[in-house]
Every structure is written in C-alpha cells, then in structure tokens.
C-alpha cells in the first residue's frame, strides 16, 4: 500500500504536462493576496531640522491580489530534466479588503533623495544635487499617495537631471507587465528529490549580490518542497524579493481545512548578525552601518536595486538589533503577526497555506552638502511599509487533496 | 549643437576691472551649471569659478575669491565672470566650459585676458 | 584640495606606439577623474570621464583605467593627431583640480 502510493505520489508531483502538481504549478490555484502597512510619518519637520526620533504610525491594510498570472514560456528540457519559466507580476487592488483607497496620502521619506545621496557620496556631486533638490523644492520627506509610492512617480527632482535618466521612482516600480525570472528549476523525472530545486536563476547558479555561500541560489521558490518533508529538515528556498537563500525550520503540526500540515518557520537565528551566526558572515557587507557586523534583523540589499539603500527586514524590526529601532518611535513587533511561516503537507512537498512578511526600509545619512540632510546628526534606516504575502488552499482543492492525498493514506 | 563661445577679454592694467561673457547655445545653461577655467600662458589648467545649476549656489577658487564674480542671465542664456582688482598673475586664457556632473564636455574658443601696466 | 600629480611630465613617441600617461590623486577620488587632450592654441576636448567611460566620437585606441587614487590613460597604437597635450582631471571634490599635463612628442 505505502509503496503504491509512494510511487504515485512520485509520479504526481513531476513537473511536467498531465501531473497534479504541474497544473497547480503553472497557475496556482491559491488567492495570493499581498497586504501592504505604510509607514506615515508624524513628525517630519522635527526629525530634518533637529534630528528627532521618526514617529511612525502604520495605515493599513492596503490589500492587492497577487500571482494570479500563469507562468511564462515554460520549456522542458529532456536533457538535463529542467523546466525553464517566467513568473510574471501583476498586482490588483481589492478595495474590499483595503482600509482606503490608493489615492490615500502617506507623509514618506524621501525615496529619490535618500537613494542620490547614498549613490553620489562624493562632494561636488551632493553640490549639484543640492541645487536640483532646491530648486525642485523637494525635501526629506514627501506627501505620496499609495499608488504612487508602491508602483510609480515621476519624481521633481531627478526630472531636473540634463540626462537620460530614469525618473520614475516606486519602490515596487516597475512591476505590472514585467515578470520575475527565467527560473530553470528540475523537474523531477530523474530525482524527485530534486523536484523544483531552482538550478539557474537568470542564467547563473549564483547572484552576484554576496561573497561566498551566502551568494548561492538554494532550494526551490518555497511555492514547494520535494515529497515526503520530514520535521528534522531545514528547509531552504530563494526569495528574489530579498536577494537572497533564506531557510526554515519545523515548529508545529497544524491541522489545515482537514489536512495535517507542518508549520515551518522562518528562525530569528536567520537574521542573527555573524557574532550569534557565523554562517551570516557574508550577508554583512559594510562596517559603518552593521557597527561592526553586530547590528543584527535589517540585510542590505543596495547591491541588488542598483545602488539604493535598501533594507529589507521582518515587520515593526521583529529580531533586529535595538540601535536599529532606536531612532524610530512607533514600532511594535510581535512573532504571530509579523514573522514568516509555510505551512507544507509533507507527502506531496506543497505549500498549501503561507505568510510572507517583509519589510522595505530606505538609510538616509547626514549630508553637509544637502540641505535638507544637513542637520541630520545619525544615520536611520527608516521602515517605508511592511507586507503580508498570504495564500491559503481553497475549500474545493482541499477537498481534492484529502480524498485523492491524505486520505488515501490515512 | 552645442557652443560657448567667450567675450570680453582684452588688456588690463593691475587693480583694474573685467567682465567676461559667455553666450551658450544648443542647451540651457542653467540645467547645467557653468564653469569657467584658465590657462595662464604655456601652463597647465586652473579651474576658476562655478555656478551650480538652476541659479543655484557659486564657489570659487581661493586665489579668486573675493575678487571674481560668477552670474548668470538665463533669459539670454549667457554667464559672466567679473574679475575685479586683477593682478599679473591673473594672465590667462579664460574658457567656460560646460559641466554638470564636474567634468567638461564642451568648452568656449577660449578669450585672453592680459593683465600688466 | 585634491592635488592630481601626472607622470611623466613629457615623452617622445612613435606613430602606432602604446603611450601609457598615470596620474595619482592626493586622497580617494572612487572614479571621478576625467582626461582630456589639448592641441597649441586650442580649447581641451573631453576623452574619459569616469576614469574608464570613452566620451562619444572619441576614437576606441584611447583606454582609462584605475580606482581610488591611481588613473592611467592609454593610447594603444598613437596617431600623427594625438601628438598633444593630455590633462587628467578629478571632479569629485571641489575645487576641481587637474594634472599638470603630460605633453606627448614626435620621437
């Protein structure tokens, strides 16, 4: 009986034409929905002219249903058992399940201003650039609605640049009508162990963002795991959101609409600066801001978005170092909220329910050449928005998964 | 097509007054920024003064400041330079030159400027 | 100030010679340097900027190279028309600051 169903499961989660698991994998049939926080800013002028603490109150959630496009030029390829493919973007906003509208106004860094000040840290450059954000009357902070901080604005500023240069600036831009990829993940049919491990992404088996380990692509995409999870295993899998290979460990079992699922979770020994976790050595890549490589909880992704400081971290600065949070006021992180977790059914490897959260932070530094950066006497690296990637298995499909899966089993 | 083309040099005597000017075409001088830069006779260059883009701040070499003055007249898409109490070593040809991230992509013919008694 | 020192000062050369010019910032300039080439009687002409970007039309023999504080311009086979003046320039710090030139001479 098990091995029967060992080789039918075997032969289900394949990825390729006719299998269960190739239908689900090509669209999902899960809802993904991606809630977004936004971090408003309540004291702007306090914190530019006196270098106060930012005092941040987050409105949300602004929700938009995500995924919901198949993949892309999905190419088989026999020799090496590969399956190639974009995974397009597309983002919808679902007003019902949003507290407002994406013309709300949100108070904001900066995010043009922020980003020049840290590529052109030379002083004649943060001369001109002075002069450009004067004459724009742009400052530290900015009024943005949510449309235009997640997907796009044409920013005053860099429009005064005598240069082709790009002038649109969204921390999601540009994101509708673009895709993510090419992803060439095996298939399986050789090594079902091996089963939507991602061999290349874009072309290389490695990101060019890190040194050593920390630069590898691992795992799959976490949309699923090669059958038969086991509790003991580290689960590892890639997040282009974050640049990086990113592990979980098991917590808990989990009864899911009928379906015994193991909760992995994303550890705060993930995020530990190399002095708790030697293994987070590379993921350190200056000393200024890092202290040293102590700070722990924000990863900079900067080499990733062209330059920008960006860092990425768990909502409200959830298992980051306290000099990290110290300069912003109002934050509370808790683990149930604001941590990440997949919920696996072991047989099959699927992910049927997940919680993805992340937060998108900018750094802005004191500058003595910029005005409106002159009085500032620290470094901050200021939250933006957080978000809550959700998608749980539907009614009908675990039905499905429970007579034709689990309940064979059981 | 971008030019600059320079005016206004000529024979000073020590202490004496001057006013460049250079009158640009092809692109907007305040997108930019101008520069002005010498060359004193069989020496190498010395940048001299510079006004920042959108009328936005000056500066100056030490061994001018005080003396010489950078402006700009947008609506005729023409910079100045106003070299007061003028020394020998003043002796120069005097570019403008185009910049806008601190490298010059286009420069003037260039306008002597002589000064002795 | 940022002094830029080029070397050397003056070089004799043939035509279709490699001719290598190094220039040394006082303090880190990243990339920030620029060169030029400067003819008797003439305004300079932009080469490279960014200490490795060829400036458009300027032909593909002229190369920059170098970080921080050490820059090199090379001419890898030199024509008639480059016997001239050549001049780097660091446009990182203000005052911009240029080498004392290196002038380049008929063998």
């Known amino acids: 009986g098990d091995l029967l169903i060992q080789k039918t499961i075997k032969k289900q989660v394949v990825l390729e034409e006719g299998t269960i698991a190739f239908k689900n994998w090509v669209k999902t049939g899960t809802e993904v929905y991606r809630q977004f926080w936004i971090f408003d800013v309540q004291n702007p002028q306090e914190v530019m002219m006196n270098s106060s603490n930012i005092q941040v109150k987050q409105r949300g959630p602004y929700t938009y249903r995500v995924r919901f496009l198949a993949k892309e030029n999905v190419t088989q390829d026999a020799e090496d058992n590969t399956v190639s493919f974009l995974q397009p973007n597309g983002a919808i906003f679902e007003p019902s399940l949003s507290v407002g509208t994406e013309a709300d106004n949100f108070t904001v860094l900066n995010l043009a201003v922020a980003a020049a000040s840290h590529i052109y840290q030379n002083q004649f450059v943060q001369m001109i650039l002075n002069s450009l954000i004067n004459k724009s009357k742009s400052s530290m902070f900015q009024v943005r609605t949510l449309r235009e901080l997640l997907w796009g604005y044409r920013d005053p500023f860099l429009s005064l640049v005598p240069y082709p240069v790009t002038t649109t600036v969204g921390l999601f831009y540009p994101y509708n009508n673009t895709a993510d990829g090419v992803y060439k993940v095996f298939n399986g049919k050789d090594n079902i162990s091996k089963v939507a491990i991602i061999d290349t992404y874009k072309g290389k088996r490695n990101l060019s963002y890190w040194e050593s380990h920390c630069d590898m692509i691992n795992g799959t995409d976490a949309a699923s795991f090669p059958p038969f999870v086991e509790k003991s295993q580290v689960l590892q899998f890639f997040s282009s959101d974050i640049c990086r290979s990113i592990y979980a460990v098991f917590e808990s079992d989990v009864n899911l609409k009928g379906i015994p699922v193991y909760r992995f979770v994303l550890p705060s020994k993930a995020f530990a600066s190399p002095v708790e976790n030697p293994d987070n050595y590379c993921f350190c890549t200056e000393k200024i801001i890092s202290k040293n490589c102590t700070s722990y909880g924000v990863l900079d992704i900067s080499k990733c978005k062209e330059g920008r400081p960006v860092y990425i971290s768990l909502p409200h600065f959830l298992y980051a170092s306290p000099d990290v949070s110290e300069p912003i006021d109002g934050l509370n992180p808790n683990e149930e909220e604001h941590r990440t977790y997949l919920d696996i059914e072991p047989i099959t490897g699927f992910t049927l329910q997940f919680a993805k959260r992340l937060q998108v932070n900018l750094l802005v530094k004191p500058s003595e050449k910029i005005q409106v950066l002159k009085n500032l006497k620290r470094n901050y690296i200021v939250p933006i928005l957080w978000l809550n990637e959700t998608g749980t298995i539907g009614d009908e499909k675990a039905n499905m998964f429970r007579s034709q899966v689990t309940g064979k089993i059981n | 097509e971008v030019q600059l083309v320079e005016s206004g040099g000529g024979l000073v005597q020590p202490g004496g007054s001057l006013r460049l000017s250079c009158a640009a075409s092809g692109f907007t001088i305040s997108s930019f920024g101008i520069h002005w830069v010498r060359q004193a006779p069989g020496k190498g260059l010395e940048w001299v003064a510079w006004?920042?883009?959108?009328?936005?701040?000056?500066y100056y070499a030490d061994s001018v400041k005080g003396r010489f003055t950078i402006s700009a007249d947008t609506s005729k898409n023409t910079a100045y330079l106003q070299m007061n109490s003028l020394r020998a070593e003043d002796t120069a040809v005097y570019y403008c030159?185009?910049?806008?991230?601190?490298?010059?992509?286009?420069w003037g013919q260039g306008t002597l400027v002589t000064v002795s008694s | 100030d940022i002094q830029m020192t080029q070397s050397p000062s003056s070089l004799s050369a043939s035509v279709g010679d490699r001719v290598t010019i190094t220039c040394r910032a006082s303090?880190?300039?990243?990339?920030?340097v620029a060169w030029y080439q400067q003819k008797p009687g003439k305004a300079p002409k932009l080469l490279i900027s960014y200490a490795t970007s060829l400036y458009s039309g300027v032909p593909s023999r002229f190369s920059g190279s170098g970080s921080g504080t050490d820059f090199t311009l090379t001419i890898s086979s030199l024509q008639p028309e480059d016997f001239a003046t050549y001049y780097c320039q660091q446009h990182s710090n203000a005052p911009l600051t240029f080498g004392q030139g290196t002038k380049v001479e008929i063998k």
């Open positions: 030159a185009r910049s806008f991230f601190g490298y010059f992509d286009y």
């Open positions: 303090q880190d300039v990243s990339n920030w």
């Open positions: 006004i920042a883009p959108y009328g936005g701040d000056t």
